[in-house]
Interface confidence: low
């Protein structure tokens, strides 16, 4: 999937399996990514687990779990708030669009999370105070945690290079991967561009991600995934000057 | 957890009987309770690095000290016998201090926190 980190780095990650996105004293988010096509290096998010840890007199520990074709509007215990404590309503799940869009607000830690199902796959966006991000027991033992540290270099796809190399061609390969199987319905480059331009008129990294995803999969739902990801940034990002990211800010080796 | 911030919180609340906005003639006693609270947080500081409740308390104490013109030096108070649930925004009036604290623990007395964003989408 495409990742925008807390430090506004933009990466395309081919990580498969379960990986932690966020892990601190208050919140643990883990995603499971699966290949979009058999044998493809590109992966998308098929499962998401969010753990809100027990917090003082506000909320009990709560677990939220979403999977492909299952975007519940409740925690796994069936509740929609933080439990039985006095401040339980400082953690709330709201269903925005049934089966497609859920918002979780954890006011006690100033955090808003948006989870969507777009097509077969999930998207995730969060707005969180730096103080919460930095609330960890031991920085030295912090494992790989994607929102903070990004993907390991060997798990990144240079999709901008791919984007440049595929102008005028259909999707035939993936950077950093063996030749990807042809998508069931591969778009010509021009069609991909046109479809992405419709939803994403600014040629930023979200637009480029959209083009990459269409060329890689032929699945038009990925246009909406990029569109909603940008919409979520508009809602959640505190710096309105950083809504759009462009090539010059892309992650370089050495991080 | 070795961080004893909740103990400091409850001692402060028992010392002030949960009064949210002490009247001016209560201020010396309130300041003494605040100084005790500050002392308690300093004692547990080393084990509370990165603890959200701890940092909230430290900011809250500073704000309340300045609001009530409390001097940093002066007498401290002993906690009373009965304790109340710890709460965060002690200067706010509310029927339910715990909810107030939970709802507002990141909209503290001063500036809005620095927010950050992370997102994951597509392939």
């Amino acid at each position: 999937p495409h990742l925008r980190t807390f430090t506004d780095r933009f990466q395309t990650c081919k990580v498969q399996g379960a990986w932690p996105l966020i892990d601190n004293n208050y919140l643990n988010v883990q995603v499971t990514n699966t290949p979009v096509l058999p044998g493809s290096a590109a992966t998308a998010t098929s499962k998401l687990t969010i753990i809100f840890k027990n917090f003082q007199e506000c909320v009990d520990q709560k677990v939220y779990q979403a999977e492909m074709d299952e975007l519940p509007a409740a925690f796994v215990d069936g509740s929609k708030n933080g439990g039985d404590k006095h401040g339980a309503n400082s953690l709330k799940i709201t269903e925005k669009v049934s089966g497609q869009h859920v918002e979780i607000r954890a006011k006690y830690i100033g955090t808003t999370i948006v989870v969507r199902q777009v097509g077969r796959y999930l998207t995730f966006a969060v707005r969180v105070p730096e103080e919460v991000v930095n609330a960890v027991e031991d920085w030295d033992s912090q494992g790989l945690y994607l929102c903070l540290r990004g993907c390991p270099l060997n798990q990144q796809i240079d999709f901008q290079a791919f984007h440049t190399n595929t102008e005028g061609t259909g999707a035939r390969r993936l950077a950093a991967a063996s030749p990807a199987p042809t998508a069931p319905e591969t778009f010509p480059y021009e069609t991909a561009v046109a479809k992405c331009k419709e939803k994403l008129p600014v040629e930023d990294l979200y637009y480029q991600a959209c083009v990459f995803d269409l060329l890689t999969t032929g699945d038009v739902n990925f246009t909406l995934a990029a569109y909603y990801a940008l919409e979520d940034v508009k809602m959640l990002h505190s710096n309105k000057d950083k809504l759009h990211l462009y090539e010059r800010t892309r992650d370089l080796p050495g991080r | 957890s070795p961080c004893k911030i909740l103990k400091c919180n409850s001692e402060f609340w028992s010392a002030t009987s949960g009064s949210h906005a002490p009247a001016s003639d209560d201020t010396p006693e309130f300041c003494a309770a605040l100084r005790s609270y500050a002392l308690c947080t300093r004692r547990t500081a080393r084990t509370c690095r990165g603890d959200l409740a701890y940092h909230s308390a430290v900011h809250g104490i500073e704000d309340l000290m300045s609001q009530h013109n409390c001097s940093k030096d002066g007498p401290t108070s002993q906690p009373r016998l009965h304790t109340l649930p710890p709460a965060g925004d002690s200067q706010e009036r509310s029927d339910s201090p715990e909810i107030c604290h939970c709802e507002k623990s990141f909209h503290k007395h001063s500036a809005t926190p620095n927010y950050t964003h992370c997102g994951l989408f597509g392939d």
């Epitope: 520990q61 709560k62 796994v76 | -």
Partner: antibody, heavy 120, light 109 residues
Framework: EVQLVQSGAEVKKPGASVKVSCKAS????????ISWVRQAPGQGLDWMGW????????NYAQKLQGRVTMTTDTSTSTAYMELSSLRSEDTAVYYC?????????????WGQGTLVTVSS | QSALTQPRSVSGSPGQSVTISCTGT?????????VSWYQQHPGKAPKLMLY???KRPSGVPDRFSGSKSGNTASLTISGLQAEDEADYYC?????????FGGGTKVTVL
Amino acid sequence: EVQLVQSGAEVKKPGASVKVSCKASGYTFTSHGISWVRQAPGQGLDWMGWISPYSGNTNYAQKLQGRVTMTTDTSTSTAYMELSSLRSEDTAVYYCARVGSGPYYYMDVWGQGTLVTVSS
Amino acid sequence: QSALTQPRSVSGSPGQSVTISCTGTSSSVGDSIYVSWYQQHPGKAPKLMLYDVTKRPSGVPDRFSGSKSGNTASLTISGLQAEDEADYYCKSYAGTDTLFGGGTKVTVL
């Protein structure tokens, strides 16, 4: 102190049912799930299922589906596990354990165990 | 047959370190953050020793530690003591069922 106190030992005949209780104290009963785990003599631990006292949601081990029923009574903070159509291989110590918000969570507090003997 | 495989027994002298492995599949161990470990003395209820692979509940000595590599989770007891002699079980969650390992008897020589 957080505690789970279970009912006493039972002797049952094959084909009968048994209902074991587990009374919780020292914490908010609806804030945690309850899992049931059994242990046959000289054997390892065997997970039976999970119930959320908050919602009544259950998650049973596949091999026990249809034979096990887990319930809770929030007014008395008590969880119950009923196993029907008992057979001799159901002879075991049955434990209740407190877990987090989902069936997959760790079990941080355990009851003392209830020995159920199935014998003709 | 348990879906999580543990050695039947391990032993060590006081002060030594012993490691117990717990091998499963990618879904039960490899991809899971929900691995926990339990200690059980004869005739007693199990006791939680580690959770979420590496985390130690309060009251559990720091000589108990956890790790995971691939599809194998491990519990290490460093500085073995007489009271550590017990059965140890790993637990994880795969799909719909919670799984326990078959148990490992730790003997202090």
